[in-house]
Interface confidence: low
């Protein structure tokens, strides 16, 4: 489909005659008539099997034609075509008198022909017009003409059908060809199809609106390559979806069991050693000096006692001092210049002379010690923590540092060993002499129930339409990873498609 | 301009047959792609049925698969349904419709359709 314009632009009849050489009068009040036809070689009257087109009275004599396409005027004159365009064609354009106003043919006399001009050839469809002048003996018309397209058809012969869109059945323009040009972020035979944001997985990302990435079940992330864990997973990831793998110093079926609580909370005070011994246990090895569970405790050099003869003990930065009582001098005061007669013992002690009065002992009463009986008796001598707990003197009380295994004030009860919960997977654990025993329940085997040994819940292949099956170790069923399409806890469903049209 | 013309519809008894045409014209018939398409009172649009521009490419839903048969006549600009062991529930206006591309996806023109009731 395509239209063949003509541009009349002059007319030249000097002497305002007619073809038969009679004058017009008052002068030629001139029309035009065209006839478009296929090509013949000599063009001869007949059908203009392409179209016609008559003009109004455009001049008087000689006149120049005025380009009237602007104002929706008749010049270019327009002869459309609904057919493939031949790349040839006839040409008749006559120049006529008209005495009145009545242009029909048959209103007109016979003679009132002015000039009539005949061409053919070849014209290949383009936006440039071809300027002509036919002369005759009494009359010359300079024109152009050209064949373009109608709206929405391209190609050489305008017969490719293309019209430009963006909406659901494709998002195009129109290459000069008629061949499709896709609209940014849209590709396809017809542009139907968004290009998703760039990095998105081919796989586990669609989209439905160009630059997105929408994620397929059991995918995360902007680009959809990020797999989602399995629900309840707290420290573990996944390599495909719905799985948990646990981080380094985690445990448990969902990656929430402590494995290492020394480096995620570093419990130990003062520079202490760390070790873990299961989950959510770790033991202190204290730097000199320091002491308690997580050596938190700061051992001063003086709860030793180092200072004799009731001397009093002074905490240093670098040690300790002892401040001597009157008649006794050393490190740690143990020199005495004092006798029996000087009455060094106290709390009731009795003075006993050595060395001829160049010494002396006291004999202290129970409950107190020391050599000037200055003292009272240290409580953990009497060893009171009991299954190897460590006694530590605390002032006027002591408390007992009890062995793992043991509890209590000194370390007299028995830690169950099964306080630690060390069976796994609901097993029942009982209490023995010298250790426990797990009773596991049914689909578990191992010392501590650790073995799995129930059959794989996939092994029936219960899931449908080529989908993913994942067994969940935490209740022994399965999970179905459906593909696109499909839905249902099996993927049994295909998901509706447009609820309209489905093709 | 598009035009869709509908014709065939009428009355036919369950099991019966009938052959429903689509008349084109206003563009150039081998360039889109033709379909069907029905509406049964008080119910969603239920696309039935779509050839491809050439011809090479059919489309079933699966309620008439291996009853209806549809096919093409570029001599006469025409799409043709054959309509096999029709049911009651076939009973509906069955409109032809293009999408205005080549391939069969979604509709752009129709027509005014035709009728088709199944009952005895």
């Known amino acids: 489909s395509g239209v063949f314009q003509l541009q009349l632009q002059e007319f030249i009849n000097e002497r305002g005659v007619l073809a038969s050489g009679r004058p017009c009068e008052p002068g030629c009040r001139t029309f035009f008539r065209v006839c478009l036809k296929h090509f013949q070689a000599v063009v001869s009257p007949g059908p203009c099997t392409f179209g016609t087109v008559s003009t109004p009275v455009l001049g008087t004599n000689s006149f120049a034609v005025r380009d009237d396409s602007s104002g929706g005027g008749r010049n270019p004159l327009q002869l459309p075509f609904n057919f493939t365009w031949p790349g040839t064609f006839s040409l008749i354009i006559e120049a006529w008198h008209a005495p009145g106003d009545d242009l029909r043919p048959e209103a007109l006399p016979p003679d009132a022909l002015i000039s009539k001009i005949a061409i053919q050839g070849s014209l290949a469809v383009g936006q440039n017009w071809l300027l002509d002048e036919q002369t005759s003996t009494l009359t010359r018309l300079r024109y152009s003409y050209r064949v373009i397209c109608s709206d929405n058809y391209y190609g050489d012969n305008c017969s490719r059908l293309c019209k430009k869109r963006n909406d659901h059945f494709g998002h195009y323009v129109c290459q000069p060809d008629g061949n499709l040009s896709c609209l940014p972020g849209w590709t396809g035979e017809y542009c139907q199809q968004p290009i998703c944001l760039s990095g998105c997985h081919e796989q586990n990302g669609y989209c439905s609106k160009p630059a997105e990435c929408l994620c397929r079940p059991g995918w995360q992330g902007r680009l959809c390559n990020e797999c989602i864990p399995h629900n309840g997973c707290r420290h573990g990831t996944c390599s495909t979806p719905w799985q948990c793998t646990c981080d380094e110093g985690w445990g448990g079926l969902f990656c929430d069991q402590d494995l290492n609580y020394c480096t995620h909370h570093s419990p130990c005070k003062n520079g202490a050693t760390c070790s873990n011994s299961g989950q959510r246990s770790y033991t202190c090895t204290c730097r000199p000096g320091y002491t308690g569970v997580d050596c938190e405790l700061e051992l001063s050099e003086c709860d030793s006692n180092p200072c004799r003869n009731g001397g009093s003990c002074k905490d240093q930065e670098d040690g300790y001092h002892c401040l001597c009582p009157p008649g006794y001098y050393g490190l740690h005061c143990e020199h005495s210049t004092l006798s029996c007669a000087d009455s060094p013992c106290f709390n009731g002690g009795s003075c006993r002379e050595r060395n001829q009065g160049a010494n002396y002992a006291c004999e202290c009463p129970p409950n107190f010690t020391g050599s000037n009986c200055e003292k009272k008796v240290d409580r953990c001598t009497s060893n009171p923590c009991a299954n190897g707990g460590q006694c530590l003197n605390r002032g006027p009380s002591r408390m007992c540092r009890c062995r793992p295994g043991f509890t209590g004030t000194y370390c007299e009860l028995h830690v169950s060993d099964c306080a630690r919960n060390p069976c796994a997977h609901g097993g029942t654990c009982h209490d023995l002499e010298n250790g426990l025993m797990c009773t596991c329940p049914a689909g578990f085997s191992g010392r501590r129930c650790e073995v799995r040994t129930s059959i794989d819940a996939c092994a029936s292949s219960p899931c449908f339409n080529r989908a993913t099956c994942y067994t969940d170790l935490s209740t022994d069923t399965f999970v179905c990873n459906c593909p696109y399409g499909f839905v249902g806890s099996r993927c049994e469903f295909p998901v509706g498609l447009p609820p309209s049209f489905p093709w | 301009e598009v035009q869709l013309v509908e014709s065939g519809g009428g009355l036919v008894q369950p099991g019966g047959s009938l052959r429903l045409s689509c008349t084109a014209s206003g563009f150039t018939f081998d360039v889109y792609a033709i379909g069907w398409f029905r509406q049964a009172p008080g119910k969603e649009p239920e696309g039935i049925s779509c050839i491809s521009s050439s011809g090479s490419i059919t489309y079933y839903a699966d309620s008439v698969k291996g009853r209806f048969t549809i096919s093409r006549d570029s001599a006469k600009n025409t799409v043709y349904l054959q309509m096999n062991s029709l049911k009651p529930e076939d009973t509906a206006v069955y409109y032809c419709?293009?999408?205005?591309?080549?391939?069969?996806?979604?509709?752009?023109?129709w027509g005014q359709g035709t009728q088709v009731t199944v009952s005895s």
């Open positions: 419709a293009t999408p205005g591309i080549a391939a069969c996806r979604g509709i752009h023109y």
